[in-house]
């Protein structure tokens, strides 16, 4: 039975040209995290494999930095980066858990972080 929950940074906003850290955390399970995939809609941004390290999709290599931890840093933000991001945790023996983050990239300098929330 899958008992874990994914905690994410929730709905977040950031300034155009700035950077943002996409972060998820898996809790309430003893399952081993083998890999985390980061996706935007149907596009892979990066993979962090516990043993093999990081894969960064070539189309994002100049704007995505691995970490901190299993998270992902998105740099040089544009308004086109607005949208849904997913962290997909591959675990053993539970299987996969998915968390969702919505990022809004703002033209103005007023960009606030939303509250943290959980997805079961």
């Amino acid at each position: 039975m899958m008992t874990g929950t994914i905690e994410t940074t929730g709905n977040i906003s950031a300034e155009k040209g700035g950077s943002i850290i996409l972060q998820c955390h898996l809790s309430s399970t003893t399952a081993q995290v083998t890999q985390v995939n980061w996706e935007q809609q149907d596009q892979l941004l990066a993979i962090c494999n516990a043993d093999l390290g990081w894969h960064i999709s070539p189309s994002f290599k100049d704007r995505v930095a691995p970490g901190p931890g299993l998270g992902l840093t998105l740099q040089s933000l544009t308004v086109n980066d607005t949208g849904e991001y997913f962290c997909i945790y591959h675990t053993y023996p539970d299987g996969t858990y998915t968390g969702r983050i919505f990022l809004e990239v703002l033209e103005s300098s007023v960009a606030e972080h939303g509250a943290r929330f959980q997805i079961p």
Partner: antibody, heavy 119, light 107 residues
């Protein structure tokens, strides 16, 4: 020039073990993951597992059920793949490969080592 | 494990032909797909990754596309040196898995 040079062909008895070596040159050994892939005669490619020399992380294809061990000697930039409890179905060409930096794509390959398992 | 199914398993074509090879994943793999070329008695060579970027030195006649579960390798104008077997591979999740291969033969 990146090169992966593998050890020579082996003939083994069923139940025994084989250890294939792969000497890397032309790049910094600790900066790239080494993978092992095999190909049975006339068949396709099968991923065996990988070794990350940066932090000694090792991952295996569970189809080999603990029969495979991948190690490395960083001082000589050499990776090793040992397969135990050999059976005739393990007869194949074994390739070591290097993964590109920050890419899960195998960009350079060794020449292959033929392992024949026969009684 | 994710299954990668290639089609056709073999094809006959002439120099100058446009050749298309498809690869279908048994589940979503986003764009985590790589293509290799292998000639008899030789090690595979990296052609295309992610899944539309050509590796260093790969001619522009080779192109890749696709996302999700369906992927395509296209050779726009087949050359004599392109007669080989082509494999797709996914790295979306371990174990990494390959397609069964497509052998491109001379007609």
């Amino acid at each position: 020039e990146v090169q992966l040079v593998q050890s020579g062909a082996e003939v083994k008895k069923p139940g025994s073990s084989v250890k294939v070596s792969c000497k890397a040159s032309g790049y910094t050994f600790t900066e790239h993951v080494i993978h092992w892939v095999r190909q049975a005669p006339g068949q396709g490619l099968e991923w065996i597992g990988g070794f990350n020399p940066n932090h000694d992380g090792t991952i295996y294809n569970q189809i080999f059920r603990g029969r495979v061990t991948i190690t490395a000697d960083k001082s000589t930039s050499t990776a090793y793949m040992e397969l135990s409890s050999l059976r005739s179905e393990d007869t194949a060409v074994y390739f070591c490969t290097r993964a590109a930096k920050l890419l899960f794509a195998m960009d350079y390959w060794g020449q292959g080592t033929t392992v024949t398992v026969s009684s | 494990d994710i299954q990668m199914t290639q089609s056709p398993s073999s094809l006959s074509a002439s120099v100058g032909d446009r050749v298309t090879i498809t690869c279908k994943a048994s589940q979503h793999v986003s764009n985590a797909v790589v293509w290799y070329q292998q000639k008899p008695g030789k090690a595979p060579k990296l052609l295309i990754y992610s899944p539309s970027y050509r590796f260093t030195g790969v001619p522009s006649r080779f192109s890749g596309s696709g996302s999700g579960t369906d992927f395509t390798l296209t050779i726009s104008s087949l050359q004599p040196e392109d007669f080989a077997t082509y494999y797709c591979q996914q790295h979306y999740s371990t174990p990494w898995t390959f397609g069964g291969g497509t052998k491109v033969e001379i007609k």
